[in-house]
Amino acid sequence: LTCLGGFASPGPVPPSTALRELIEELVNITQNQKAPLCNGSMVWSINLTAGMYCAALESLINVSGCSAIEKTQRMLSGFCPHKVSAGQFSSLHVRDTKIEVAQFVKDLLLHLKKLFREGQFN
């Protein structure tokens, strides 16, 4: 991915900026969390090393009525080259266990921070 649209600033956004904004949003979610995130809703755990952005979106898109992660869902859609809709989960994707959204966000944040430090913006 060389440019991404639909984020805070207008027009094309450099991948490093888009990734930083996604990280900032996830930090915001984890720091502002008081009650259980998304009422304790659970999502499919994903492999963070393979097709992560689309897989993360496919998992999180199934959480409805949770305003806290709506921005994250929109931002992830900018990283995923194909359209993802609720209920869609590739049969090739592992569906092994569900974890709470809060744990999912925390793990995703840790992984994205690692990618950012290593300069892997795409």
């Epitope: 009422n39 659970m42 592992v94 092994d96 266990t97 569900k98 709470e100």
Partner: antibody, heavy 124, light 107 residues
Framework: QVQLKESGPGLVAPSQSLSITCTVS????????VNWVRQPPGKGLEWLGI???????DYNSALKSRLIINKDNSKSQVFLKMNSLQTDDTARYFC??????????????????WGQGTSVTVSS | DVQMIQSPSSLSASLGDIVTMTCQAS??????LNWFQQKPGKAPKLLIF???NLEDGVPSRFSGSRYGTNFTLTISSLEDEDMATYFC?????????FGGGTKLEIK
Amino acid sequence: QVQLKESGPGLVAPSQSLSITCTVSGFSLTGYGVNWVRQPPGKGLEWLGIIWGDGSTDYNSALKSRLIINKDNSKSQVFLKMNSLQTDDTARYFCARDKTFYYDGFYRGRMDYWGQGTSVTVSS
Amino acid sequence: DVQMIQSPSSLSASLGDIVTMTCQASQGTSINLNWFQQKPGKAPKLLIFGASNLEDGVPSRFSGSRYGTNFTLTISSLEDEDMATYFCLQHSYLPWTFGGGTKLEIK
């Protein structure tokens, strides 16, 4: 200690529905998934479905139209309802806890504790 | 659905023998395999999870390994109490599916 115990009707008439209760102790239903698995006499095991800690469910697609799994967290009970029973639904029905662990890059599940099962015969 | 082909369907071995049985997945990568032991009239008991992790309280003579989509359960020195039927389960692709079982008898 962790325990699961199934209770069911034993005998069900063809075309009728089956209701089984799994009562658990030693863990909270909000923190674990609970599976339903069945085993026809002398045969192998078949996964029916799971209810997760948040109450969401996933079913075996082959049986999805006939199954409902729900639970009462406060009573530590999980319920299986199966409609339109036929003789080939005769089996021992088990509930089993699903425990999460981290493996191969992400979270996985394992069926670590099982109930002793309840036998269901479909016959007129 | 992912089919789990388990072999052999039955086997007979002597006390102290090394026993192996296998499960092969029809498709899928990164499969989380569980192995269970079931004795007549009893519930299945978890032995191995994640293909090679020994469940707490399970004797160390049981071990699991994986090579691609092939999974093996090995009993290093067969004991009388190991007479049972063994099932594998793939816990990774819905619907989760079990192998047909391997019935182990003592010679």
